[in-house]
Protein backbone atom coordinates (compact mmCIF):
# COMPACT_ATOMS: atom_id res chain seq x y z
CA UNK A 1 0.00 0.00 0.00
CA UNK A 2 1.25 3.40 -0.73
CA UNK A 3 2.93 5.20 2.04
CA UNK A 4 3.44 9.07 1.85
CA UNK A 5 5.69 11.44 3.95
CA UNK A 6 3.61 10.80 7.20
CA UNK A 7 4.26 7.45 7.43
CA UNK A 8 5.73 5.83 10.51
CA UNK A 9 9.48 6.04 10.62
CA UNK A 10 11.40 7.51 13.14
CA UNK A 11 12.97 11.04 12.02
CA UNK A 12 16.36 9.67 14.00
CA UNK A 13 16.23 7.09 11.47
CA UNK A 14 15.72 9.55 8.85
CA UNK A 15 18.14 12.06 9.90
CA UNK A 16 20.46 9.23 10.35
CA UNK A 17 20.20 8.10 6.79
CA UNK A 18 20.64 11.30 5.34
CA UNK A 19 24.01 11.46 7.22
CA UNK A 20 25.16 7.95 5.64
CA UNK A 21 23.90 8.48 2.36
CA UNK A 22 25.96 12.11 2.24
CA UNK A 23 28.94 10.23 4.22
CA UNK A 24 28.88 7.81 1.05
CA UNK A 25 28.19 10.22 -1.76
CA UNK A 26 32.22 12.39 -0.29
CA UNK A 27 33.72 9.11 -0.64
CA UNK A 28 32.20 7.88 -3.84
CA UNK A 29 32.92 11.66 -5.05
CA UNK A 30 36.67 10.97 -3.37
CA UNK A 31 37.04 7.94 -5.56
CA UNK A 32 35.81 9.47 -8.89
CA UNK A 33 38.10 12.41 -8.34
CA UNK A 34 41.34 9.77 -7.64
CA UNK A 35 40.12 8.04 -10.69
CA UNK A 36 39.86 10.93 -13.01
CA UNK A 37 43.33 12.47 -11.38
CA UNK A 38 45.50 9.40 -11.08
CA UNK A 39 44.37 7.28 -14.56
CA UNK A 40 42.42 10.21 -16.85
CA UNK A 41 39.50 8.45 -16.36
CA UNK A 42 36.79 11.39 -15.86
CA UNK A 43 33.50 10.36 -17.94
CA UNK A 44 31.37 7.60 -16.92
CA UNK A 45 29.86 8.69 -20.10
CA UNK A 46 32.14 7.29 -22.33
CA UNK A 47 33.00 4.39 -20.43
CA UNK A 48 28.87 2.64 -21.22
CA UNK A 49 29.28 0.30 -23.90
CA UNK A 50 32.43 -1.21 -21.70
CA UNK A 51 29.73 -1.22 -18.63
CA UNK A 52 27.44 -3.21 -20.82
CA UNK A 53 30.18 -6.14 -21.76
CA UNK A 54 31.17 -6.09 -18.32
CA UNK A 55 27.97 -6.84 -16.77
CA UNK A 56 27.92 -3.76 -14.16
CA UNK A 57 24.58 -3.88 -12.85
CA UNK A 58 21.97 -1.11 -11.92
CA UNK A 59 20.05 -1.23 -8.38
CA UNK A 60 16.47 -0.45 -9.08
CA UNK A 61 14.29 2.11 -6.53
CA UNK A 62 10.93 1.61 -7.94
CA UNK A 63 8.77 0.84 -5.37
CA UNK A 64 10.40 4.66 -4.01
CA UNK A 65 8.81 7.40 -6.03
CA UNK A 66 7.18 10.11 -4.08
CA UNK A 67 3.93 9.90 -5.44
CA UNK A 68 3.11 6.42 -4.58
CA UNK A 69 5.97 5.49 -2.28
CA UNK A 70 5.36 1.08 -0.62
CA UNK A 71 7.36 1.59 2.50
CA UNK A 72 8.18 -1.66 2.74
CA UNK A 73 9.14 -2.06 -0.83
CA UNK A 74 10.94 1.07 -0.49
CA UNK A 75 13.15 0.21 2.36
CA UNK A 76 13.73 -3.14 1.04
CA UNK A 77 15.18 -1.66 -2.45
CA UNK A 78 17.42 0.67 -0.79
CA UNK A 79 18.55 -2.24 1.56
CA UNK A 80 19.14 -4.72 -1.74
CA UNK A 81 20.69 -1.96 -3.65
CA UNK A 82 23.44 -1.14 -0.76
CA UNK A 83 23.97 -5.17 -0.76
CA UNK A 84 24.52 -5.14 -4.66
CA UNK A 85 27.15 -2.12 -4.28
CA UNK A 86 28.69 -4.16 -1.34
CA UNK A 87 28.83 -6.83 -4.15
CA UNK A 88 30.24 -4.52 -6.57
CA UNK A 89 32.92 -2.64 -4.47
CA UNK A 90 34.64 -5.85 -3.25
CA UNK A 91 34.82 -6.75 -6.76
CA UNK A 92 37.14 -3.61 -7.57
CA UNK A 93 39.34 -4.85 -4.70
CA UNK A 94 43.25 -4.47 -5.81
CA UNK A 95 42.27 -1.61 -8.08
CA UNK A 96 45.12 0.35 -6.94
CA UNK A 97 47.82 1.21 -4.01
CA UNK A 98 46.27 4.92 -4.52
CA UNK A 99 42.85 3.96 -4.39
CA UNK A 100 42.69 1.18 -1.69
CA UNK A 101 41.91 3.35 1.34
CA UNK A 102 39.21 5.14 -0.24
CA UNK A 103 37.52 2.36 -1.72
CA UNK A 104 37.83 0.44 1.67
CA UNK A 105 36.22 3.72 3.97
CA UNK A 106 33.50 3.76 0.98
CA UNK A 107 33.04 -0.54 1.12
CA UNK A 108 32.35 -0.19 4.97
CA UNK A 109 30.04 3.10 4.97
CA UNK A 110 27.61 1.28 2.27
CA UNK A 111 28.16 -1.61 4.79
CA UNK A 112 27.17 0.42 7.46
CA UNK A 113 24.12 2.07 5.87
CA UNK A 114 22.84 -1.00 5.05
CA UNK A 115 23.00 -2.33 8.48
CA UNK A 116 21.05 0.89 9.44
CA UNK A 117 18.43 0.23 6.68
CA UNK A 118 18.07 -3.26 7.58
CA UNK A 119 17.28 -2.30 11.57
CA UNK A 120 14.99 -0.10 10.76
CA UNK A 121 12.81 -3.04 9.01
CA UNK A 122 13.35 -5.34 11.99
CA UNK A 123 12.24 -2.72 14.17
CA UNK A 124 8.96 -2.34 11.65
CA UNK A 125 8.61 -6.19 10.88
CA UNK A 126 9.25 -6.04 7.81
CA UNK A 127 12.31 -7.67 7.58
CA UNK A 128 12.78 -10.23 5.22
CA UNK A 129 13.41 -14.08 6.82
CA UNK A 130 16.61 -14.21 5.27
CA UNK A 131 18.98 -12.24 3.35
CA UNK A 132 19.46 -11.65 -0.03
CA UNK A 133 22.24 -13.78 -1.41
CA UNK A 134 24.75 -12.26 -3.85
CA UNK A 135 24.71 -12.55 -7.42
CA UNK A 136 27.12 -12.54 -10.08
CA UNK A 137 29.66 -9.86 -10.10
CA UNK A 138 31.47 -8.94 -12.99
CA UNK A 139 34.82 -10.79 -13.39
CA UNK A 140 37.54 -7.83 -14.42
CA UNK A 141 40.52 -9.32 -16.41
CA UNK A 142 42.55 -5.93 -16.66
CA UNK A 143 43.80 -3.41 -14.34
CA UNK A 144 41.94 -0.85 -17.16
CA UNK A 145 39.08 -3.01 -16.76
CA UNK A 146 39.21 -2.52 -13.08
CA UNK A 147 39.69 1.17 -13.10
CA UNK A 148 36.83 1.54 -15.57
CA UNK A 149 34.66 -0.89 -13.65
CA UNK A 150 36.06 1.87 -10.49
CA UNK A 151 34.04 4.65 -12.19
CA UNK A 152 30.91 3.10 -13.62
CA UNK A 153 30.28 1.58 -10.16
CA UNK A 154 30.81 5.10 -8.44
CA UNK A 155 28.89 6.30 -11.03
CA UNK A 156 25.57 4.26 -10.32
CA UNK A 157 26.36 4.16 -6.97
CA UNK A 158 26.31 8.15 -7.22
CA UNK A 159 23.04 7.61 -9.05
CA UNK A 160 21.32 5.28 -6.74
CA UNK A 161 22.32 7.90 -3.84
CA UNK A 162 20.80 10.60 -5.29
CA UNK A 163 17.59 9.25 -4.93
CA UNK A 164 18.23 7.18 -1.96
CA UNK A 165 18.32 11.27 -0.35
CA UNK A 166 15.16 12.67 -2.51
CA UNK A 167 13.40 10.04 -1.01
CA UNK A 168 14.52 10.36 2.76
CA UNK A 169 14.12 13.72 2.93
CA UNK A 170 10.71 13.74 1.40
CA UNK A 171 9.89 10.65 4.04
CA UNK A 172 11.46 13.55 6.74
CA UNK A 173 9.63 16.52 6.03
CA UNK A 174 6.65 17.24 8.78
CA UNK B 1 20.07 -7.96 24.92
CA UNK B 2 23.09 -8.18 22.75
CA UNK B 3 26.36 -10.29 23.66
CA UNK B 4 29.44 -10.71 22.53
CA UNK B 5 31.05 -14.01 24.06
CA UNK B 6 34.84 -14.55 23.19
CA UNK B 7 37.01 -17.91 23.39
CA UNK B 8 39.37 -18.01 26.26
CA UNK B 9 43.16 -17.43 27.34
CA UNK B 10 45.89 -18.99 24.92
CA UNK B 11 49.13 -20.04 25.15
CA UNK B 12 51.60 -20.23 22.21
CA UNK B 13 55.09 -21.20 21.00
CA UNK B 14 56.60 -18.30 18.64
CA UNK B 15 56.13 -19.51 14.94
CA UNK B 16 52.58 -21.04 15.85
CA UNK B 17 48.91 -20.11 14.63
CA UNK B 18 45.78 -19.08 17.52
CA UNK B 19 42.54 -19.09 16.28
CA UNK B 20 40.01 -16.40 18.21
CA UNK B 21 36.26 -16.90 18.20
CA UNK B 22 33.66 -14.38 18.98
CA UNK B 23 30.17 -15.88 19.47
CA UNK B 24 27.31 -13.25 18.43
CA UNK B 25 23.95 -13.51 20.05
CA UNK B 26 21.15 -10.99 20.58
CA UNK B 27 20.85 -9.77 17.07
CA UNK B 28 20.73 -10.81 13.50
CA UNK B 29 24.33 -11.60 13.26
CA UNK B 30 25.06 -11.06 9.41
CA UNK B 31 24.03 -7.96 9.31
CA UNK B 32 26.34 -6.06 11.10
CA UNK B 33 30.13 -6.15 10.56
CA UNK B 34 32.40 -7.19 13.28
CA UNK B 35 35.56 -5.53 14.43
CA UNK B 36 39.05 -6.71 16.10
CA UNK B 37 41.17 -4.23 18.54
CA UNK B 38 44.47 -5.56 19.80
CA UNK B 39 45.52 -4.41 23.08
CA UNK B 40 49.36 -5.00 23.63
CA UNK B 41 50.06 -5.43 27.86
CA UNK B 42 50.06 -1.92 29.35
CA UNK B 43 49.27 -0.23 25.65
CA UNK B 44 46.33 1.47 23.94
CA UNK B 45 43.81 0.32 21.39
CA UNK B 46 44.70 -0.85 17.70
CA UNK B 47 42.42 -1.38 15.06
CA UNK B 48 43.01 -4.28 13.33
CA UNK B 49 40.16 -4.76 10.80
CA UNK B 50 36.45 -6.16 10.21
CA UNK B 51 34.49 -8.82 8.54
CA UNK B 52 31.56 -8.24 6.85
CA UNK B 53 29.99 -11.75 7.52
CA UNK B 54 26.63 -10.90 4.99
CA UNK B 55 29.11 -11.27 1.59
CA UNK B 56 32.02 -12.67 3.60
CA UNK B 57 34.05 -9.39 3.52
CA UNK B 58 37.27 -8.82 5.66
CA UNK B 59 39.20 -5.52 5.35
CA UNK B 60 42.56 -5.08 7.24
CA UNK B 61 44.73 -2.67 8.90
CA UNK B 62 47.75 -2.38 6.54
CA UNK B 63 49.53 -3.12 10.09
CA UNK B 64 47.99 -6.70 10.31
CA UNK B 65 47.69 -7.59 6.76
CA UNK B 66 50.19 -10.51 6.87
CA UNK B 67 49.18 -11.28 10.82
CA UNK B 68 45.80 -11.53 10.95
CA UNK B 69 42.46 -13.80 8.78
CA UNK B 70 38.97 -12.66 9.80
CA UNK B 71 36.34 -15.42 8.78
CA UNK B 72 32.44 -15.72 10.05
CA UNK B 73 30.37 -18.15 9.81
CA UNK B 74 26.87 -17.25 10.06
CA UNK B 75 25.48 -20.32 10.59
CA UNK B 76 26.99 -20.50 14.75
CA UNK B 77 26.90 -16.53 14.48
CA UNK B 78 30.62 -16.54 15.38
CA UNK B 79 33.08 -14.37 13.76
CA UNK B 80 36.87 -15.91 14.01
CA UNK B 81 40.11 -14.25 13.40
CA UNK B 82 43.58 -16.30 13.29
CA UNK B 83 47.15 -14.95 13.80
CA UNK B 84 49.81 -16.58 12.04
CA UNK B 85 53.39 -16.97 12.72
CA UNK B 86 52.81 -15.40 16.08
CA UNK B 87 55.97 -13.46 17.91
CA UNK B 88 56.45 -11.98 21.44
CA UNK B 89 54.93 -8.61 20.19
CA UNK B 90 51.76 -10.52 19.30
CA UNK B 91 50.97 -11.09 23.32
CA UNK B 92 48.12 -9.35 23.86
CA UNK B 93 44.01 -9.22 24.70
CA UNK B 94 42.66 -8.87 21.11
CA UNK B 95 38.86 -7.66 21.24
CA UNK B 96 35.78 -7.87 19.21
CA UNK B 97 33.26 -5.41 19.14
CA UNK B 98 30.03 -4.93 16.79
CA UNK B 99 30.06 -2.64 13.76
CA UNK B 100 27.72 0.28 12.94
CA UNK B 101 26.73 3.71 12.50
CA UNK B 102 26.76 6.53 14.89
CA UNK B 103 25.70 5.25 18.26
CA UNK B 104 26.17 1.63 17.00
CA UNK B 105 29.69 1.71 16.10
CA UNK B 106 31.90 -0.19 19.51
CA UNK B 107 28.77 -0.30 21.11
CA UNK B 108 29.25 -4.08 21.83
CA UNK B 109 32.55 -5.46 23.15
CA UNK B 110 33.37 -8.99 23.65
CA UNK B 111 35.10 -9.72 27.16
CA UNK B 112 38.41 -10.23 25.49
CA UNK B 113 41.01 -12.99 24.34
CA UNK B 114 44.52 -13.01 26.00
CA UNK B 115 46.83 -14.56 23.38
CA UNK B 116 50.32 -15.12 24.97
CA UNK B 117 53.55 -15.96 22.72
CA UNK B 118 56.55 -17.61 24.81
CA UNK B 119 58.80 -20.24 24.40
CA UNK C 1 46.49 7.24 8.49
CA UNK C 2 44.96 9.42 10.88
CA UNK C 3 47.08 9.95 14.25
CA UNK C 4 44.90 10.79 17.33
CA UNK C 5 47.16 12.43 19.82
CA UNK C 6 45.80 12.74 23.54
CA UNK C 7 46.96 14.81 26.75
CA UNK C 8 47.51 14.57 29.34
CA UNK C 9 48.21 10.78 29.32
CA UNK C 10 47.90 10.96 33.51
CA UNK C 11 45.33 12.96 35.28
CA UNK C 12 45.32 12.73 39.11
CA UNK C 13 41.45 14.44 40.34
CA UNK C 14 39.61 14.72 43.25
CA UNK C 15 36.63 13.91 43.68
CA UNK C 16 33.85 16.07 42.85
CA UNK C 17 36.39 18.14 41.00
CA UNK C 18 36.26 18.73 36.78
CA UNK C 19 38.37 17.04 34.25
CA UNK C 20 39.50 17.58 30.81
CA UNK C 21 40.99 15.34 28.19
CA UNK C 22 42.34 17.27 25.27
CA UNK C 23 42.47 14.93 21.81
CA UNK C 24 44.12 15.90 18.57
CA UNK C 25 43.84 15.06 14.92
CA UNK C 26 46.00 14.81 12.04
CA UNK C 27 43.56 15.12 10.19
CA UNK C 28 40.04 17.55 9.92
CA UNK C 29 37.52 14.68 11.06
CA UNK C 30 34.21 17.19 10.06
CA UNK C 31 32.58 15.67 7.29
CA UNK C 32 30.66 18.13 4.43
CA UNK C 33 27.87 16.17 5.79
CA UNK C 34 28.40 18.16 8.99
CA UNK C 35 29.49 15.40 11.13
CA UNK C 36 32.55 14.95 12.99
CA UNK C 37 33.55 11.79 13.52
CA UNK C 38 35.58 11.51 16.79
CA UNK C 39 34.71 9.08 19.44
CA UNK C 40 35.20 8.69 23.30
CA UNK C 41 35.60 4.87 24.97
CA UNK C 42 36.22 4.09 28.78
CA UNK C 43 38.20 1.39 29.90
CA UNK C 44 37.76 0.77 33.45
CA UNK C 45 40.36 -1.25 35.04
CA UNK C 46 39.85 -5.14 33.78
CA UNK C 47 36.73 -4.71 31.67
CA UNK C 48 36.84 -4.19 27.73
CA UNK C 49 35.96 -0.21 26.51
CA UNK C 50 32.48 1.07 26.79
CA UNK C 51 31.34 3.74 24.43
CA UNK C 52 31.01 7.25 25.85
CA UNK C 53 30.92 9.88 23.34
CA UNK C 54 30.06 9.35 19.32
CA UNK C 55 30.51 12.19 16.99
CA UNK C 56 32.26 14.38 18.97
CA UNK C 57 29.30 15.64 21.49
CA UNK C 58 26.88 12.94 21.62
CA UNK C 59 26.05 11.04 24.64
CA UNK C 60 25.94 7.23 24.23
CA UNK C 61 23.06 5.48 25.55
CA UNK C 62 23.14 5.08 29.96
CA UNK C 63 26.12 7.51 30.12
CA UNK C 64 25.62 10.23 32.82
CA UNK C 65 25.20 13.32 31.78
CA UNK C 66 28.64 14.95 33.42
CA UNK C 67 30.30 13.73 30.57
CA UNK C 68 30.56 15.75 28.04
CA UNK C 69 32.17 15.91 24.25
CA UNK C 70 33.39 19.10 22.57
CA UNK C 71 35.37 20.25 19.97
CA UNK C 72 36.77 21.59 16.27
CA UNK C 73 37.79 19.37 12.99
CA UNK C 74 40.97 18.85 14.81
CA UNK C 75 41.24 19.20 18.47
CA UNK C 76 38.35 17.68 20.76
CA UNK C 77 37.81 17.89 24.35
CA UNK C 78 36.52 15.58 26.66
CA UNK C 79 35.13 16.98 29.86
CA UNK C 80 33.74 15.27 33.30
CA UNK C 81 31.67 17.74 35.40
CA UNK C 82 32.09 16.42 38.41
CA UNK C 83 34.42 13.13 38.90
CA UNK C 84 33.38 10.17 40.85
CA UNK C 85 35.24 7.58 41.93
CA UNK C 86 33.54 5.10 39.22
CA UNK C 87 34.97 7.22 36.33
CA UNK C 88 38.47 6.03 37.04
CA UNK C 89 40.01 3.57 34.05
CA UNK C 90 41.66 5.04 30.81
CA UNK C 91 39.69 7.01 28.35
CA UNK C 92 40.55 6.75 24.38
CA UNK C 93 39.71 9.17 21.81
CA UNK C 94 39.12 7.85 18.13
CA UNK C 95 38.19 8.44 14.60
CA UNK C 96 36.42 6.66 12.32
CA UNK C 97 36.06 8.92 9.54
CA UNK C 98 38.19 6.61 7.15
CA UNK C 99 40.08 3.56 7.53
CA UNK C 100 41.69 2.83 9.23
CA UNK C 101 40.15 4.03 12.60
CA UNK C 102 42.92 4.63 14.55
CA UNK C 103 43.01 5.86 18.76
CA UNK C 104 44.38 7.95 20.59
CA UNK C 105 47.28 7.01 23.10
CA UNK C 106 44.86 7.36 26.28
CA UNK C 107 44.80 9.16 29.13
CA UNK C 108 44.58 7.22 32.48
CA UNK C 109 42.40 9.29 35.21
CA UNK C 110 42.97 8.08 38.84
CA UNK C 111 41.59 9.82 41.80
CA UNK C 112 43.79 11.54 43.76
Known amino acids: TPLGPASSLPQSFLLKCLEQVRKIQGDGAALQEKLCATYKLCHPEELVLLGHSLGIPWAPLSSCPSQALQLAGCLSQLHSGLFLYQGLLQALEGISPELGPTLDTLQLDVADFATTIWQQMEELGMAPALQPTQGAMPAFASAFQRRAGGVLVASHLQSFLEVSYRVLRHLAQP | QVHLVQSGAEVKKPGASVKVSCKASGYTFPIYTMHWIKQAPGQGLEWIGYINPSIGYANYNQKFRDKATLTADKSTSTAYMELSSLRSEDTAVYYCARGGYGDSLFAYWGQGTLVTVSS | DIVMTQSPLSLPVTPGEPASISCRSSKSLLHSNGITYLYWYLQKPGQSPQLLIY???NLASGVPDRFSGSGSGTDFTLKISRVEAEDVGVYYC?????????FGQGTKLEIK
Open chain 3, 55 to 57: QMS
Open chain 3, 94 to 102: AQNLELPYT
